[in-house]
């Protein structure tokens, strides 16, 4: 689409100039008021999935404390609130967009009608046009002279949302541009709602019904124009015929005046037929706006019908999930409390159980100790008995003989009756070592 | 306990695309966003975006706006990133995590080469 | 963006010694902030969230403290298995941002 309009814009820019720049300056404010809308709602979206995402981290760990439970609460409303600025905000937007659209789509209605009336209508119809377009607005004019089909065509547009089936434009071409790729086969179904994560199946497949009709419309529209087309170019050539042989004729000469009165009845019946064509469309269209209007506003009850419900729906599931919560705390509270009882009367009786046995254990030590010291006295005891024993056996009366010192001793006296009387007579022997066996039978030289 | 499971390594051509998928057990699915973390050959790590499993909100980094798309199913406790119109400079470890990046996936070596 | 302003890009310690890491955000965070220990040929394993609480399984000798902009992490007694790369997470605002990472090895 993008590529069609700057191509188209580009081919007539020269013969344009003024109109050009014009729609181009408008495109661009178009453009970045889009851009700035855009970041406004990523900005808007952003700080709620943050939020959102900052609750789960909250929830995590839940602390049954009034102060917990209270930031929680701030954080759920937070939440809830900036949701709903949001939605109350799109919400304007996109009636103000709606608005907009019927606008401009009746401006465009009209200008396609005028444009088909200059390409089908005969003279008659084009004088009728100029005579009422003077007192009409323009995008009231709704000639009877159209085809079925156009007509036909238009209302289906009027009443299903446009060229778009009421559809935003981001939507509606990615739909028709995953169509095209599959050339209508049903499997384009799951990528469009890849390509589309805000719409549901259903929607998709009320959409594509709503296309096809679309498009068999459009094309029953161009062939009856093509149709008219061919049946106008006909008629000119008939026309042109009898003009022809009318020339060739004699003239008939008729009273001047009279013929002007005539033209002048004409003129007028024509154009209060025309007139009441007019004011019959009008009431046709008028009827039909305040039946689309009491249908779309039936719509919107019904939406905050569904959004109430919604909030209700919603508003209950937190509160069942804040007493489940409150319940679950209760219940591990409790059974922390039981375990937390049970652990101290455990530690009691470990505790008891443990000093008894400390007990019997310095008990036995305290016997132990007694045994010891008592067998340490028994061996001091036996001890000193040992050495008295000795003591008595030591002590023994010797009467003391002081002349002993003087007189040898017994061994002494032992050992000088032995030695003979001293002399130094010849040696007869002298002893020799023994000689070994294996040397015994060996001559010594001498 | 918690654990984020991810597929092996992939080895692709530039310019195609790659699904990772990120399975998760031991914990209730809905209940914590799923992060996805890109970790380049020698480089820091790069946060991606995340996704609330419950209603399928997504948030981007810019910078991979266009190159990854999130999404979850539901039905198998498993997120998934694609990667599209790949080129040298994607070729990474991608890690999911979740519940404040306490837990991590092992992460898939996305590898792209001619 | 948030810019997350990490320091010191790298440093060398011994074993036993304390070891503090910084992190600057460019904005109050309101302590939204992990922090992440990756050791090459590994998932990132995060150690500290939330700015100060401690993960389960991590051990003691790791602390995280700080608020508004401000944040550290220390390490009580630097032990030889807590080499690698330390990062700080923000996840206050989108899109969540990292710093650019201390290299910490051992003298």
């Known amino acids: 689409m993008e590529k069609d309009k700057h191509s188209h814009f580009y081919n007539q820019k020269s013969d344009f100039r003024i109109e050009h720049s014009m729609l181009e300056e408008l495109e661009n404010k178009l453009i970045h008021s889009r851009k700035t809308e855009r970041a406004k709602i990523q900005q808007q979206l952003a700080k709620i999935h943050n939020n959102v995402k900052k609750l789960q981290h909250q929830l995590k760990d839940v602390k049954p404390t009034p102060d917990f439970v209270e930031k929680l609460r701030e954080m759920m409303e937070e939440i809830e609130n900036a949701i709903n600025t949001f939605k109350e905000e799109q919400r304007l937007i996109y009636e103000e967009l709606i608005k907009e659209e019927k606008t401009t789509n009746n401006e465009l209605s009209a200008i396609s009608r005028k444009i088909d009336t200059w390409a089908l209508g005969n003279s008659e119809t084009e004088k009728a046009f100029r005579a009422i377009s003077s007192k009409v607005p323009v995008d009231k004019v709704t000639p009877s002279t159209l085809p079925e089909e156009v007509l036909d065509f238009e209302k289906f547009l009027q009443q299903t949302g446009g060229r778009q089936g009421a559809w935003d434009d981001y939507d509606h071409q990615n739909f028709v541009k995953v169509r095209n790729k599959h050339k209508g086969k049903p499997t384009f179904m799951e990528e469009v709602l890849e390509h589309l994560p805000g719409k549901t199946q259903d929607e998709v497949q009320q959409h594509e019904k709503w296309y096809q009709k679309f498009l068999a419309l459009e094309e029953r529209k161009k062939e009856s124009i093509q149709i008219w087309k061919t049946k106008k170019q006909q008629k000119r050539e008939e026309i042109f015929k009898l003009k022809e042989k009318a020339d060739n004729t004699p003239v008939l000469f008729h009273n001047k005046q009279e013929d002007n009165q005539k033209q002048k009845e004409e003129q007028r019946k024509k154009q209060k037929l025309a007139v009441e064509a007019w004011k019959k469309q009008k009431s046709i269209e008028m009827s039909m706006k305040c039946a689309s209007q009491l249908k779309e506003e039936e719509e919107k009850e019904k939406k905050h019908q569904k959004e109430r419900q919604r909030q209700f729906k919603l508003k209950l599931l937190l509160e069942s999930y804040t007493q489940q919560k409150k319940e679950q705390e209760e219940f591990l509270r409790l059974e922390k409390e039981i375990r937390e009882k049970a652990e101290k009367a455990e530690k009691r009786k470990n505790a008891a159980d443990e000093i008894s046995r400390f007990q019997e254990r310095d008990l036995h030590k305290l016997e132990l100790k007694i045994l010891d010291r008592q067998a340490k006295e028994d061996e001091k005891s036996q001890k000193q008995r040992r050495l008295a024993k000795l003591k008595e056996k030591v002590e023994n009366n010797v009467s003391r003989d002081p002349s002993r010192l003087y007189k040898p001793t017994k061994g002494w006296e032992e050992r000088t009756k032995k030695i003979g009387p001293t002399g130094s007579g010849p040696l007869l022997h002298i002893p020799h070592r023994a000689i070994p066996t294996w040397r015994q039978g060996i001559q010594r030289r001498v | 306990q918690v654990q984020l499971q991810q597929s092996g390594p992939e080895l692709v051509k530039p310019g195609a695309s790659v699904k990772i998928p990120c399975k998760t057990s031991?914990?209730?699915?809905?209940?914590?966003?799923i992060d996805w973390v890109k970790q380049g050959l020698g480089e820091s790590l790069e946060w991606i975006g995340d996704?609330?499993?419950?209603?399928?909100?997504?948030m981007y980094n810019q910078k991979f706006k266009g190159k990854a798309t999130l999404t979850v199913d539901k039905s198998s406790n498993t997120a998934y990133m694609e990667l599209r119109s790949l080129t040298s400079e994607d070729t990474a470890v991608y890690y999911c995590?979740?519940?404040?990046?306490?837990?991590w996936g092992q992460g898939t070596l996305v590898t792209v080469s001619a | 963006d948030i810019q997350m302003n990490q320091s010191p890009s790298s440093m060398f310690a011994s074993l036993g010694e304390r070891v503090t890491i910084t992190c600057r955000a460019s904005?109050?965070?309101?302590?939204?902030l992990s922090w992440i220990q990756r050791k090459p040929g590994k998932s990132p394993k995060t150690l500290i969230y939330?700015?100060?609480r401690l993960v389960d399984g991590v051990p003691s000798r790791f602390s995280g403290s700080g608020s508004g902009q401000d944040y550290s992490l220390t390490i009580s007694s630097l032990e030889y298995e807590d080499m690698g790369i330390y990062y700080c997470?923000?996840?206050?605002?989108?899109?969540?941002?990292f710093g650019g990472g201390t290299k910490l090895e051992i003298k």
């Open positions: 995590a979740h519940d404040e990046f306490i837990y």
């Open positions: 031991g914990y209730s699915f809905t209940d914590y966003n």
């Open positions: 996704i609330n499993p419950n209603y399928g909100g997504t």
């Open positions: 904005q109050d965070i309101n302590t939204y």
């Open positions: 939330r700015a100060n």
């Open positions: 997470l923000q996840y206050d605002e989108f899109p969540h941002t």
